[in-house]
Interface confidence: low
């Protein structure tokens, strides 16, 4: 049977097949894919900017940062305000102080410990 390069199309992931000769073809890949048949998802993570222990998760023509709990934002560079998230983080009248990557308690009246409970 006669070989027709683009019938059926060898291009995957939405790539468009173009016949370049009697027995040759090329695939025009959608953004985010590469390879002779668009078989490879381009790794968008090599140039990532995930900070503070964020993990880069490759997507199709994009990436996302999976942030640890105490950080947020596109690149995990924004400090989560634990004092807002945990209104009762400090006991016995202690004052919650937000810090980069965490929080601390300023204790009063002789109380001590991480949460002023001692």
């Amino acid at each position: 049977s006669l070989y027709v390069p683009c019938a059926p199309s060898p291009c995957v992931n939405g790539g468009t097949c173009r016949q370049t000769g009697d027995f040759t073809f090329e695939c025009n890949c959608l953004p985010g894919f590469e390879g002779s048949t668009c078989e490879r998802n381009i790794d968008d993570c090599p140039n990532h900017r995930c900070q503070n222990g964020g993990v880069c998760v490759d997507g199709v023509n994009t990436y996302n940062c999976r942030c640890p709990p105490q950080w947020t934002g596109q690149f995990c560079t924004e400090d989560v305000d634990e004092c807002l998230l945990q209104p009762n983080a400090c006991q016995n009248g202690g004052t919650c102080a937000n810090r980069n990557g965490g929080y601390g308690c300023v204790c009063v009246n002789g109380w001590s410990g991480d949460d002023c409970s001692e």
Epitope: G32, D44, N47, R49, G53, Q74, F75
Partner: antibody, heavy 117, light 112 residues
Amino acid sequence: EVQLVQSGAEVKKPGESLKISCKGSGYTFSNYVIHWVRQMPGKGPEWTGYIIPGSGGTKFNEKFKGQATISVDKSITTAYLQWSSLKASDTAMYYCARDGAGSFTYWGQGTLVTVSS
Amino acid sequence: DVLMTQTPVSLPVSLGGQVSISCRSSQSLVHSDGNTYLHWFLQKPGQSPQLLIYRISNRFSGVPDRFSGSGSGTDFTLKISRVEPEDLGVYYCLQSTHFPDTFGGGTKVEIK
């Protein structure tokens, strides 16, 4: 205060090895990518490569691949750029810079490397 | 690699005057995450480059409001509204949307 302090100027002969350093302080060292940027005399800066201190993972500009290595010692919050065999064309100012906001937010003072016979 | 072209190469200015520096990229700098990673730096004589503007128009901490950035896609501009002596030096644009990060060739701002 965030600070990156680099080692002093070096004069070397072609073929010699060299390791220059960049000590970070005033922030959590492991949390931020450290870049190395080359600036040849009278030219603009060129991004060379980076290291992720937390994991030790590196990424290089293809143009510089195989010419130098980047390493880190987390215990002393220091990143390194190292050559095993210097060439005259390695003569340049080398800057380390801390990542942030998708850019280079803080820079070291630079280390001038001169390679001459 | 993305080519970053800055104009002019040299810019003679009067103190108190206004400055406009152009930076063009060989391809769009809009990242698939929606951000545009185009930044501006100043390198004063004998010093390290310092970040002025990140992601087109955001002033870095401590940068005076006489510096402003604008633009989109492939065309970007840095403006200095009232030039002061400490503004003299070489200005560079940098793109970090596409790997590898690439700098423009620089614009030297000097006294007329």
